[in-house]
Structure formats: C-alpha cells, structure tokens
C-alpha cells in the first residue's frame, strides 16, 4: 500500500482551476526527492506533465505549477484554464513514475453549469461590485423596472424602480435608469456575499409584453495564494483591493478556528500584541493597495491570512478580500540570532544581524521600529557611512564578522533606547530580522571619564578601566566616525583600581593623543572584542581648546566632566518610507534625498569614506 495520499476524485468546470494537494510521510528522503504529476495512458504508462525538478510539459506550459512543502509533507499541483481534454486518470507521486510511491487521481472537467438561453454570466470576487445590465424596449420605458432572484422554483423580488429593496440587500444595492436615449437600466450590487450567487431575472414591465433578461451571478471566494517562508525570516503580503475601497479602512487578519479572523493589523491603529515590533502596514497607494511586512517569523505565524477593506477595520460579510496560506519552513536558511539583547543605562549593546551571505556587497541598514499608527521604521545607520544625527558618536554599523553577519554597536544607552530594531539590507527582503533591546538595572562594565577637554599642541591621556571579567578579551581604543571606528594605539597600564573585588586581571588601558590638533576633536570609544565579535563599548567626547597654561593633561575618572544632555530629536530626522523598506529598489532614491540633507547639516563634513581595507584597525 502506497503511503502517498490525495483526492481520489477531482471535479471542476471548463476554464476553472484546481489545486491538488498530495500528502506524503515527511521523512528526510521524501522531503527532498522528486515530486511529479503524470497522466496515465491506456497502456499503463504514466507520462510526466510536471515535476518538482522544473520539468513542465508543453500541454501545461503557462498554466500549471508544482510546489513542494517539505515541512508539511505535501506538494500542490495547480492547473489553470481547464478544458474537457484534461479529464482523465492521473498519479501524483514521489521518485520515479514507474515505482510504487504514488496515488491515483481521477480528474473530471465538465462543460459548466447549464444556463438558460440568452443568460449573461457575471463572475465577480467576493466583496466586490457587480453591475447587471438590463435592456428594454421603448414601449416599456415608463413601466416598472425590477430585478428578481431565483430561489428554488420561485423568483424573489430584489429591487424595483418604485423604491423597494429586499432586506438582504439593504445599503448595498441601487437601480439606475440610463438617460432617455439609452434603453437600459442597471442594478449595481456592492459588497458581494457568497449568498448573492445565483440566477437573476431583470424585467421591464409587468404584463405579457414585458422585457426579460436572465443573469447568472457567480461570486468567487478567493483562492488562497500559497506563501512559503523561512523561520526567522520575513513575509510581505501585497494587498490590492481596487480603487473603489481606496478610502475604506484596511486590515490583515489571521483565521483562527471556525470563521473567526483575528485582526493582525489595521489602518485604524489596531495591532495584535504577538506582532509588536515586527510588523509594518505600508501606506496605501492612491489605488487603495497596501502591503504588510512581518519579520521574525515564528512557527505559530503559519496559517491563513486575509486582507480586506471594511469601515470597522475587520472582516465582515461583504468585505472584499485577498487570501494567503502561509507556511513557515522550520528548516530555515536564516541562522538563529538573539531576539532580545539586554544593556544597562550608560552601557552598550552589540547586535549581530544576519544577512544572505550571497549578498555580501549589499547595503546594510538598521532601523528603529515605531508602533505609532500603522508602524514605521526610520533608519538610524547604514553601511555606506550614514548615521542619523542624533546617534552620532554612539552608533556604528560594522561589516564584521562578515560572511552572513554584520554588527551594530549602540552605546551611551538610556531607557529611551529600549525597543524593537530591524536589521535589513537592500538585497534579499526575506532576510529582515528583529531584535528587542531591553534596558535593565545595573552599571556599565567599562569605566571612562565623561567629557574630556584637550589642549591644542599638548598630550592627552584618556583612561579606560576594564574589569577582570574581560581579561581574555582584546581591548582597544578607536576614534568614531560615520563609517565605523578606526583603531588607535593604546597602552596597557596594568591592573585598574576602579573595581572593588577585582583581582590583578582588571586592566587600565589608556589612549594617548600626542600634540593634539583640531582634527583630534570627536568621539572615542574603548571596547572589548574577541576576534571579529564585539562586546561592550564606552564612549568619551574629546573637545579641543586653545592653550591656557603649559603641560599635558592626564584625565582621571574623578576629573571627568558631567555627561552632556542627551540630544533631542529634531524635525530633520531621516526616515525611510515603509515602502522603501519593503521594496529595496526604492532605497537609492531615498538615499539621494537623505545625502543632500546630511551634507546640508554638516554631518558629513570631513568624513573619509574610504574602503574598509583602507581604514584598517580593529573595528572595520
């Protein structure tokens, strides 16, 4: 007995499409072996029509596909534009056609529903609008116009020109009579329901001379589009519902048991808690289309999603909808990385961001997710040397360790830095990941002075105290700029006295600036790393002033100036439109705008954006 299972009989009508799902035991071998769909011949052979290895018969060209879902142990054969010639006996199977791992499927394609003579067929999607046109002759121009629906054997009045409207259609139907020149009336039904489907009769006049026209209304429930994405990756649902609902509230919901559809996000500001920090509803285009991006996909995100439009911002009968069935592949190509990173006030975090290693030359970005309205993610830093003004001196994006991972370092943390951040590139949009930064109680591990003032032409020594827990780490000083942090020579001055309960393994490492010049002004970081993996950092701002009295300056922790007040957000902050995040091709345009703004406010002045090789040092 074959372990493959599927539908024994499939029935459809000409012009329609079918989705045939075949189930197989999801063993490792089965998941990766060839899947096929073949037609059984009279003499017992089975001719392949489509396979998972890319073969498509000329009979199926442009109208069929085969999708394997290894995680679920299923594969789906979609066949469109059916004709009666497609009727026959088929097999869906694994491996080689002649072997026994297959299931017999009978497909019968019939001519379609028998319709009355002169019947106009209207095929419309659920939730949309249909206009049924009803011609009449001059003698009935002044007579009553009506539309009936055939319920069983009886016609039931739906609407007429005297003002009657059947209660089932209240608020969503109208009867329009064209100008005197045109012998036509039309009935417009909005927010179509599945129950609206059926045979209709429109009539002008009520006597034996009345004009009648038959109409067959077919209301289609949308076929869910199959979407298969990797665990920890991201998915984008593009929703195009048409211009007629451009000004109606939009939503994305996920079907739970039964017919409930729980709102995931809508344009009225609702968002499901499970998606906090990892969802964006991109602004609508003029035609009413929008898209929803979900990152950090979890196993439990799998399911059926509907997008739609309704004034309530949730699924109601008659909402126009689009549907997707999301499968989340647990055999993910996206590596595990921490989803929560903790730091202390005044301290730092180093976040590892995965990217598709095939796209090492792509531009890397880091943005801060904001939940207001439909969510947005303004960029904070990129790998091309742009840093948002408010983050200068405390944020750096490093290409290291490379080979599929980049690093983002944020220091001088405050409680306001808590939140969700997205790692993304202008390459593979599926590799968007989310990390939550949490600010916890505690003291920074590295101790440095606050602001330091150096004197032109003199020598400055700045200390950094490393506790013994970092004894095995490489310790460094570097000078921060937009493109990273260039390593500087530093001196190990032996054990530090800044830590209680810390033995000889603690360290005081100093940065020495000889013959200070104006160019030495700026942010300096001390930090720890292991190979290409970065740990904690601490930042010091060095100001340079004219000489007052001779001598060199040796800064201690006690002498340090108070930390500067935190900079407040100004109105010129840079934000990538959500659309740009969803479609990296838009980055280039946005970047150009941002660059001119950066130059205008001076934040790019004197930045040498040389290659990482030229910059050398431990941080680039």
């Amino acid at each position: 007995k074959s372990p493959i299972f599927g539908p024994e009989e499939v029935n459809s009508v000409e012009g329609n499409s079918v989705s045939i799902t075949c189930y197989y035991p999801p063993t490792s071998v089965n998941r990766h072996t060839r899947k096929y769909w073949c037609r059984q011949g009279a003499r017992g052979g089975c001719i392949t029509l489509i396979s998972s290895e890319g073969y498509v018969s000329s009979k199926y060209a442009g109208r069929a596909n085969l999708t394997n879902f290894p995680e679920n142990g299923t594969f789906v054969v979609n066949i469109a534009q059916l004709s009666q010639d497609d009727s026959g006996r088929y097999k869906c199977g694994l491996g080689i056609n002649s072997r026994g791992l297959s299931f017999d499927v009978s497909l019968e394609v019939s001519q379609g529903p028998g319709l009355l003579n002169d019947t106009k067929v209207y095929t419309v999607d659920l939730g949309r609008t249909v206009t049924i046109n009803c011609p009449f002759k001059t003698e009935n121009a002044q007579k009553r116009k009506s539309l009936y629906k055939q319920i069983g054997l009886y016609p039931v009045l739906v609407i007429d020109s005297s003002g009657y409207v059947n209660p089932n259609y209240t608020g969503r139907i109208r009867l329009d009579i064209q100008g005197t020149g045109q012998l036509l009336f039309s009935v417009v039904i909005n927010q179509l329901r599945l129950s609206d489907a059926g045979q209709y009769l429109c009539q002008a006049g009520d006597d034996s001379n009345s004009n009648k026209k038959n109409a067959d209304l077919q209301v289609l429930k949308p076929e869910p589009e199959l979407v298969y994405e990797d665990l920890r990756g991201s998915v984008t649902f593009h929703c195009a519902l048409g211009p007629e609902v451009a000004n109606v509230a939009k939503f994305l919901c996920r079907q739970s048991s039964g017919e409930n559809c729980d709102v995931v996000v809508n344009t009225l500001g609702k968002r499901a808690p499970a998606f906090e920090g990892r969802i964006l509803l991109n602004p609508q285009d003029k035609d009413g289309s929008f898209s929803v991006v979900i990152t950090g996909l979890r196993k439990e995100d799998a399911g059926r999603y509907l997008c739609g439009a309704h004034s309530d911002g949730q699924l109601q009968e008659g909402s126009p909808i689009q549907a997707w069935q999301l499968f989340v592949n647990e055999e993910s190509t996206i590596p595990r990385s921490p989803t929560v990173v903790k730091g202390v006030a005044g301290g730092s975090v180093a976040v590892l961001c995965p990217y598709n290693r095939k796209e090492s030359k792509s531009i890397k970005y880091w943005c801060l997710w904001e939940g207001a309205q439909n969510g947005r993610c303004p960029l904070l830093v990129d790998s091309e040397g742009w840093v948002k003004a408010q983050y200068e001196g405390r944020l750096s994006l490093l290409e290291e360790p490379g080979n599929g991972t980049f690093t983002v370092i944020l220091n001088q943390l405050t409680s306001r830095d808590a939140g969700f951040y997205w790692c993304l590139t202008n390459g593979d949009t599926l590799w968007r990941t989310t990390v939550e930064i949490k600010i916890i109680e505690g003291e920074p591990n590295l101790k440095v002075p606050g602001n330091v003032t150096a004197v032109l032409g003199e020598t400055l020594k700045v200390p950094c105290h490393f506790p013994c827990k970092f004894s095995s780490y490489e310790k460094y000083w570097c000078k921060w700029n937009n493109t990273g942090c260039q390593a500087l020579p530093s001196q190990d001055e032996g054990p530090s006295k800044a830590f209680v309960n810390c033995d000889e393994n603690s360290r005081l490492v100093s940065l020495t600036l000889n013959l200070v010049t104006r160019a030495d002004e700026g942010w300096y970081w001390c930090g720890v790393k292991q190979g290409h993996f970065y740990g904690e950092t601490a930042a010091v701002y060095v100001a340079v002033e004219e000489r007052k009295a001779a001598g060199s300056r040796d800064v201690s922790l006690a002498k340090a100036d108070a930390a500067p007040d935190e900079k407040v957000l100004d109105s010129g902050f840079r934000e990538i439109e959500n659309k740009a995040i969803q479609d990296p091709r838009l980055f280039a345009e946005e970047k150009a705008v941002a660059d001119t703004r950066d130059q205008a406010d001076g934040s790019r002045a004197s930045v040498d954006s040389g290659s990482s090789e030229e910059q050398g040092g431990s941080s680039r």
């Epitope: 009989e9 329609n16 499409s17 299923t74 379609g112 329901r193 048991s257």
Partner: nanobody, 126 residues
C-alpha cells in the same frame, strides 16, 4: 458558528446499503471541507471520507478500507453532505460522525476539524 446534524443511521444486514446525511446550518459559507469519521466501540476515531471544495471545483478523499464501496456527495443548495454506503460489512459497525473544516490546507484525514456533529449509529449485523 456551524451546526451539524447527522441522520440515516440504523441496522442493516451485511452486503446491504445505507445513506447517511449531514445537514449544516449557521455560517456555512466559510466551510471548505466536510468529512465523515467513524468510531467503533473500544477503538479510536478514524477517517472514512471527505469532500473539499473551492470555487466550482471539488475534491473527494477516501480511506483505503472503504474505497469502491462508499461514495461521498454534496448538495450545495441544501448545505448537506451525503455518505452512500454499499456492500456493508460487520467491521463497518460504528458511530459515524460528520465534521466540517474551514481550512483548505489541513490533511482531511486528521481529526482536527473545526466542527463536529453528535454522531449516528450504524450497525451491520445479520
């Protein structure tokens, strides 16, 4: 909510026939699959047959044990699914349950259907 009511069960001799009906009411427009399961005394509930539909296409599934003997069909207008059982055997004796599922994608053989009827007893005995 969806309500399912089975009928047509009873006593029949081996080799005889029986037709079960399952009438659905409530929010039936969201149903994508209806199936029949059975549970014999002291045994686990098992899949018998199912019918799935999407647009004007339908898909019929059968357990190996009933292939060629049982036929599932659907009357769209009446929101009813039928199970025609021919060549009945004593081992077909069980309580037959009708079930409805909203998803087009779940394996129809699994018992994780969204709605269930109360069941109707079929006894095959001479």
């Amino acid at each position: 909510q969806v309500q399912l009511v089975e009928s047509g069960g009873g006593l029949v001799q081996p080799g005889g026939s029986l037709r079960l009906s399952c009438a659905a009411s409530g929010r039936t427009s969201s149903i994508s699959t209806m199936g029949w399961f059975r549970q014999a005394p002291g045994k686990e509930r098992e899949f018998v047959t199912a019918i799935r539909w999407s647009g004007s296409s339908s898909y019929k599934y059968y357990a190996d044990s009933v292939k060629g003997r049982f036929t599932i069909s659907r009357d769209n207008a009446r929101n009813t699914v039928y199970l025609q059982m021919n060549s009945l055997k004593p081992e077909d004796t069980a309580v037959y349950y009708c079930a409805a599922q909203m998803s087009l994608w779940r394996d129809p053989r699994e018992i994780d259907y969204d709605y269930w009827g109360q069941g109707t007893l079929v006894t095959v005995s001479s």
